[in-house]
Interface confidence: medium
């Protein structure tokens, strides 16, 4: 999931403490858009024909890597973050992580972090990455992340994990926005209208985005989420999530108004770009996926066939926080007043825009971002946003 937004509203002369985050875009409200929902949901759009197109009401996990050093360096930027509803709720994950070799049919190798550009977006996948059939993108849109579509389970319902980064991070803008045609093709006229046009489906290569010169992101882990809420009235599009990326970058004509990385250095230098899995089929109950995307450097082998999840802070198991020598805190914990405290506890608004904070053994903290309605919060701390209206 993108660890940064791609193209904010205009040049921000003042950093907003608590960048926007990601939520899913709304259903297309054309007359032909989407099947009727079972009942009116407060967050759904009513199509012109009276049909209700329900939003994606599930949660999207995106990684928030929090090695101690990383967190402490990032801490100054946390103080001013606006706590949104549900922010900072620390929870234990009722699931286990599968080892990479059990989940992926592709080689596991760390991607290179794409250079942070003014319109910094995430790295595109290569054609072999099973990416979603995104139609050709505007030439101005650098597609760098978000297009790692490894598989066909619905991404809006799935989380991603990002490992702590041990090296130097490149600055990334945190208030950019990517516009996407989330429901492009639902009207039968869009480029991805055919039922095969969802990630991992055959016969959609013609819609692949231009990945020239881009570095793919690699998914390492899938954590199948058995507790993500799912309402069968929700509509999961069968078309490509990336069918149209209206990347919110300013062009040469008005790039003086574009948000550049420099504006947000205090928040962004510490973020690691992540890959973005794809949407899944439009039928059946989705299985959420948790993708772990390593940063530029590997962190060694991933824990065995299952990764233990830390208990909710405050519950038994807090002793896991301290390391063997008693002087350092383990991933996801930070020393505070002489003891190791969960970042989820210490920083209630660690996850922006209503994201929930979780701790995963040997990985650290990550944020579970809300995905619903017309916008989709993404990023390691739910600090980025996708929208298509």
């Amino acid at each position: 999931v993108p660890a940064r937004e791609a193209g904010s509203a205009v040049e921000a002369e003042e950093l907003v403490k608590g960048s926007p985050a990601w939520e899913p875009p709304a259903n297309d409200t054309r007359e032909e858009a989407g099947p009727p929902a079972a009942g009116e949901d407060e967050a759904s759009w009513t199509a012109p024909g009276g049909e209700l197109a329900g939003p994606e009401e599930v949660l999207q996990e995106s990684a928030a890597v929090t090695g101690t050093a990383w967190l402490e360096a990032d801490s100054p930027g946390l103080g001013g973050v606006t706590a949104e509803a549900g922010s900072g709720d620390a929870q234990a994950l009722p699931a286990t992580l599968q080892a990479p070799h059990e989940v992926l049919g592709q080689s596991i190798m760390p991607p290179a972090i794409p250079e942070a550009t003014e319109a910094s977006g995430p790295p595109s996948p290569t054609p072999g990455d099973k990416l979603s059939p995104a139609s050709e993108l505007p030439k101005e849109s650098p597609l760098e992340v978000w297009l790692n579509l490894g598989g066909s389970t619905p991404d809006p319902q799935g989380p991603e994990l990002t490992y702590p980064f041990q090296g130097t991070l490149e600055p990334q803008p945190a208030s950019d926005i990517i516009d996407i045609d989330y429901f492009e093709g639902l009207d039968g006229e869009g480029r991805g209208a055919d039922l095969g046009s969802f990630p991992g489906s055959p016969g959609t290569s013609e819609n692949h985005p231009d990945t020239e010169g881009e570095t793919p992101s690699w998914s390492l882990l899938d954590l199948y989420d058995d507790f993500t809420p799912f309402d069968e009235s929700d509509f999961y599009p069968t078309t490509s999530f990336y069918d149209d990326l209206d990347e919110e970058e300013e062009e040469e004509e008005d790039d003086k108004d574009a948000v550049g990385g420099g504006d947000l250095e205090d928040e962004n230098e510490l973020l690691v770009p992540t890959g973005k899995p794809g949407l899944g089929p439009g039928t059946g109950q989705p299985t959420s996926r948790w993708h772990a995307v390593p940063p530029q450097h590997t962190l060694g082998s991933v824990p065995g066939s299952s990764i233990a999840l830390r208990p909710r802070p405050g519950e038994p198991g807090r002793d896991l926080a301290s390391s063997e020598n008693g002087t350092e805190c383990r991933s996801g914990f930070v020393r505070h007043n002489g003891s190791c405290r969960s970042v989820c506890d210490l920083f209630p608004s660690y996850c922006h825009n209503g994201g929930q904070c979780y701790l995963v053994e040997n990985i650290g903290a990550f944020c579970r971002c809300n995905t619903q309605d017309y916008i989709w919060h993404k990023g390691m701390r739910c600090e980025s946003i996708i929208t298509d209206f």
């Epitope: 709304a26 407060e42 967050a43 606006t82 516009d179």
Partner: antibody, heavy 117, light 111 residues
Framework: EVQLLESGGGLVQPGGSLRLSCAAS????????MSWVRQAPGKGLEWVSA????????YYADSVKGRFTISRDNSKNTLYLQMNSLRAEDTAVYYC??????????WGQGTLVTVSS | QSALTQPASVSGSPGQSITISCTGT?????????VSWYQQYAGKAPKLIIF???KRPSGVSNRFSGSKSGDTASLTISGLQAEDEADYHC???????????FGGGTKLTVL
């Protein structure tokens, strides 16, 4: 320089139709979602409709759904709003606006639509 | 009736600071950091002056600042100047439909 120029407004009888156009320049039109926002005389702003950069996704306010159709011709850098079954309450200045973040960073000068018998 | 509530008018003297409020609900203002503010002179198009609660576009004076607390977003104009006299509209992303809400607008009078 970004410029948005609306046209097509005028006086129309209730039940009639109008087609508004918005000519865009100074930016890569196809890369941005666009919206129509209206303002009734002496009133506040009201979001009317939006369309994604490719034109593949469209959105409407409930008050105009089924009567208005937003579209765009990226080859002409032009945004459209086809307004049918017009009502007196549709009387307003209609602005086209370029979306940026969850805000509108550029607006046209507006075109007045008067629905009256 | 507008979805977001703004005072119909506010006034202040040159040099003073004024604050315009914009009240919404948990599904819009309170729930997200996507409040924007527009300045509109009579007979003119709106101009974006604040987005994402507190960010200023380039070219907008730093006398304009935005904030948010709970259901209420605020626009503060410090060092009030005669040219600030205009209508000010707030807007917010809305989790319900429509996705974009506006306030009714506030007329600022510089005394």
């Amino acid at each position: 320089e970004v410029q948005l120029l609306e046209s097509g407004g005028g006086l129309v009888q209730p039940g009639g139709s109008l087609r508004l156009s918005c000519a865009a320049s100074g930016f890569t039109f196809s890369s941005y979602a666009m919206s129509w926002v209206r303002q009734a005389p002496g009133k506040g702003l009201e979001w009317v409709s939006a369309i994604s950069g490719s034109g593949g996704s469209t959105y409407y306010a409930d008050s105009v759904k089924g009567r208005f159709t937003i579209s765009r011709d990226n080859s002409k850098n032009t945004l459209y709003l086809q307004m049918n079954s017009l009502r007196a309450e549709d009387t307003a200045v209609y602005y086209c606006a370029k979306k940026r973040s969850l805000a509108f960073d550029y607006w046209g000068q507006g075109t007045l639509v008067t629905v009256s018998s | 009736q507008s979805a977001l509530t703004q005072p119909a008018s506010v006034s202040g003297s040159p040099g003073q600071s004024i604050t315009i409020s914009c009240t919404g609900t948990s599904t819009d203002v309170n729930g997200y950091n996507y409040v924007s503010w527009y300045q509109q002179y009579a007979g003119k198009a709106p101009k974006l002056i604040i987005f994402d609660v507190s960010k200023r576009p380039s070219g907008v004076s730093n006398r304009f600042s935005g904030s948010k607390s709970g259901d209420t977003a605020s626009l503060t104009i410090s060092g009030l100047q005669a040219e600030d006299e205009a209508d000010y509209h707030c807007s917010s992303y809305n989790r319900k439909r429509p996705p974009v809400l506006f306030g009714g607008g506030t007329k600022l009078t510089v005394l």
